[in-house]
Each structure stands twice: as structure tokens, then as C-alpha cells.
Interface confidence: medium
């Protein structure tokens, strides 16, 4: 399969995750016990395929309005990815463009 044109990769993926997840932080992969297709990780889901905001939200470290699964801490991220957002460095326009793309 070829990668679709509307995808999120690299820094844009991190930026968008930070925008979507806010202070909750995020995972780059999900425990296999969760929905099985998520075990591929967000890179495969969003960089190599199109993903939407709802899917991005599933990679946030704490579910927005449901109980947190404390038995599975966030996956250790590569150290070139910020684990949590650094609010004052946000480039809101970039993330707004990315999330608008995902809504389309």
C-alpha cells in the first residue's frame, strides 16, 4: 500500500499530538491489550495512513473523560520526542492547520 497524501509525520505528528492531548501527554504505541489495530503504533496509523482526530485522541496518555488505565504507563518515547507539551513553545497555527486537515 502506498502512503496517502494527507498524513502526519515527524515533527508535525508530535506537534499535533501535543495539541490534541494537551497536558495529558501521549503514547507512541498502545498496549496490545487495547484495540488490536492500535498495537501498530501511531506512526503506522497516522504517518503511513490517514488518521483522524478521534484516532489521535486514543494515543493520549489519560482518556479525556473516562477512567485511566494505571496498569499500563505510557510507552517510553525516543528521546527526540517531547514526552509532554511545552505550552509556551506551541505554534498554534501549525497545529490548527494540521487538525483542520484531519477534520476534512
Amino acid at each position: 500500500a502506498y502512503r496517502p497524501s494527507e498524513t502526519l509525520c515527524g515533527g508535525e505528528l508530535v506537534d499535533t499530538l501535543q495539541f490534541v492531548c494537551g497536558d495529558r501527554g501521549f503514547y507512541f504505541s498502545r498496549p496490545a491489550s487495547r484495540v488490536s489495530r492500535r498495537s501498530r503504533g501511531i506512526v503506522e496509523e497516522c504517518c503511513f495512513r490517514s488518521c483522524d482526530l478521534a484516532l489521535l485522541e486514543t494515543y493520549c496518555a489519560t482518556p479525556a473523560k473516562s477512567e485511566r488505565d494505571v496498569s499500563t504507563p505510557p510507552t517510553v518515547l525516543p528521546d527526540n520526542f517531547p514526552r509532554y507539551p511545552v505550552g509556551k513553545f506551541f505554534q498554534y497555527d501549525t497545529w490548527k492547520q494540521s487538525t483542520q486537515r484531519l477534520r476534512r
Partner: antibody, heavy 119, light 107 residues
Framework: EVQLLESGGGLVQPGGSLRLSCAAS???????VMWWVRQAPGKGLEWVS?????????VYADSVKGRFTISRDNSKNTLYLQMNSLRAEDTAVYYC????????????WGQGTLVTVSS | DIQMTQSPSTLSASVGDRVTITCRAS??????LAWYQQKPGKAPKLMIY???SLGSEVPSRFSGSGSGTEFTLTISSLQPEDFSTYYC?????????FGQGTRLEIK
């Protein structure tokens, strides 16, 4: 220790084919995005192709699209690059490299294998 | 695609010198920039990522700075083993792109 070892390079005539392999060890191969990057003699780095961890998704540079095919066998910890319809401008050292975090930076590279396209 | 332009193409310096290499992006890439070092006949080595973070086992004399469209790699006191070619790479999004390289040679 992470190791990437390319093989399969050599001399081929224009229009010919070659298949490069990259044997990976020292890490969980199936979890990483993998790349092929090339470097023509005396020139800079050019990314060629990228493949997702599962092998289900691929990306190609415009210069090789339709001629090269990247693939992987996670059971064998091996990355491949099938090169068809080779041209003189494909002459380069071809490196396989591990993506550090997903469409980002390349933290481990193989030693490279030279592909020479000439009549 | 985002174009990356390095300057200078060649830089002559002496052991102990402080040197700076510049990389410019054709559009803003935030801090999503890496620097690689390549010695003749060898594979590139990741030196700096996220514009300013030091790669694994990279000496502290190397540093990176910048954001947006302009970035610099600085070597505070050149050592003999630092004479190499350096490449910048943006990874804000696909396709990632490399600069054309800066060759650091002995004066």
C-alpha cells in the same frame, strides 16, 4: 549492539535489476520504520524509500517511484530494496538506516553497498 | 518539498578553532532539525537532533541552535577527528530533506 549490514550491490547495465538486502540485529526490528538512503559519488545524501514497521506502507522519492520497491521480512529481520530499470544516475552507495522515532532522524546506519550502473 | 541550504559549502579551519555551519530551511520547521557527521567512506552519524539536543556519545564541544528557518552547528574547539562533512536534515514532515553538505577541511 545494533547492527545493519547491507549486501547485494554490484555492477549492472542500464535497464538491469538488483536486489539489495539489509540484515538487522540488536533491536526489535518489527517496531521500527526503516529507510534506504543513497549517496552518489562525491555528492550528498538523498533519501530513497521508507517503510512502515509492519511493512504495509511505503514511501518513495520521486526519482525512484515506479522503479524501486522497498519491502521487509520481520520474521527474518531483513529489509530489501528491489531496483528495476536502473539508470546511470542510480549509481551510488546505498545505506539502510533505522528511524529513531518515526519519520524523524536516523540513529543507526549500515556500512553501505555500492551500486554501479554502467554499460 | 522543504529545501535545505547549507553554508558554506567548504570551510577551512585549524585544530582548536571555533567553527559554525549554517543551515536554512525554505519554510519554517520549528526545531525539527538534525545534524549528521560523515567521514570519508563511512556512514553518516547522528550528531544533533531537535536542533540542539546532543546525539549519543557526541562530544560536548558540538552544539546546535536555531529554530524556524535558520540553524547553526557549532564546534567550540576543533579536534583532528572533527574534519568531516556535515549535513543538516529537516524532519518536520515527509519528505524529509537533507542539506547539500559542508566539508570541514584542515587549513
Amino acid at each position: 549492539e545494533v547492527q545493519l549490514l547491507e549486501s547485494g550491490g554490484g555492477l549492472v547495465q542500464p535497464g538491469g535489476s538488483l536486489r539489495l538486502s539489509c540484515a538487522a540485529s540488536g533491536f526489535t526490528f518489527s517496531e521500527y520504520v526503516m529507510w534506504w538512503v543513497r549517496q552518489a559519488p562525491g555528492k550528498g545524501l538523498e533519501w530513497v524509500s521508507v517503510i512502515s514497521p509492519s511493512g504495509g506502507y511505503t514511501v518513495y522519492a520521486d526519482s525512484v517511484k515506479g522503479r524501486f520497491t522497498i519491502s521487509r521480512d520481520n520474521s527474518k529481520n531483513t529489509l530489501y530494496l528491489q531496483m528495476n530499470s536502473l539508470r546511470a544516475e542510480d549509481t551510488a552507495v546505498y545505506y539502510c538506516a533505522r528511524d529513531r522515532g518515526g519519520a524523524t532522524t536516523l540513529d543507526y546506519w549500515g556500512q553501505g553497498t555500492l551500486v554501479t550502473v554502467s554499460s | 518539498d522543504i529545501q535545505m541550504t547549507q553554508s558554506p559549502s567548504t570551510l577551512s579551519a585549524s585544530v582548536g578553532d571555533r567553527v559554525t555551519i549554517t543551515c536554512r530551511a525554505s519554510q519554517t520547521i520549528s526545531s525539527w532539525l538534525a545534524w549528521y557527521q560523515q567521514k570519508p567512506g563511512k556512514a553518516p552519524k547522528l550528531m544533533i537532533y531537535k536542533a540542539a539536543s546532543l546525539g549519543s556519545e557526541v562530544p560536548s564541544r558540538f552544539s546546535g541552535s536555531g529554530s524556524g528557518t535558520e540553524f547553526t552547528l557549532t564546534i567550540s574547539s576543533l579536534q583532528p577527528e572533527d574534519f568531516s562533512t556535515y549535513y543538516c536534515q529537516q524532519y518536520k514532515t515527509y519528505p524529509v530533506t537533507f542539506g547539500q553538505g559542508t566539508r570541514l577541511e584542515i587549513k
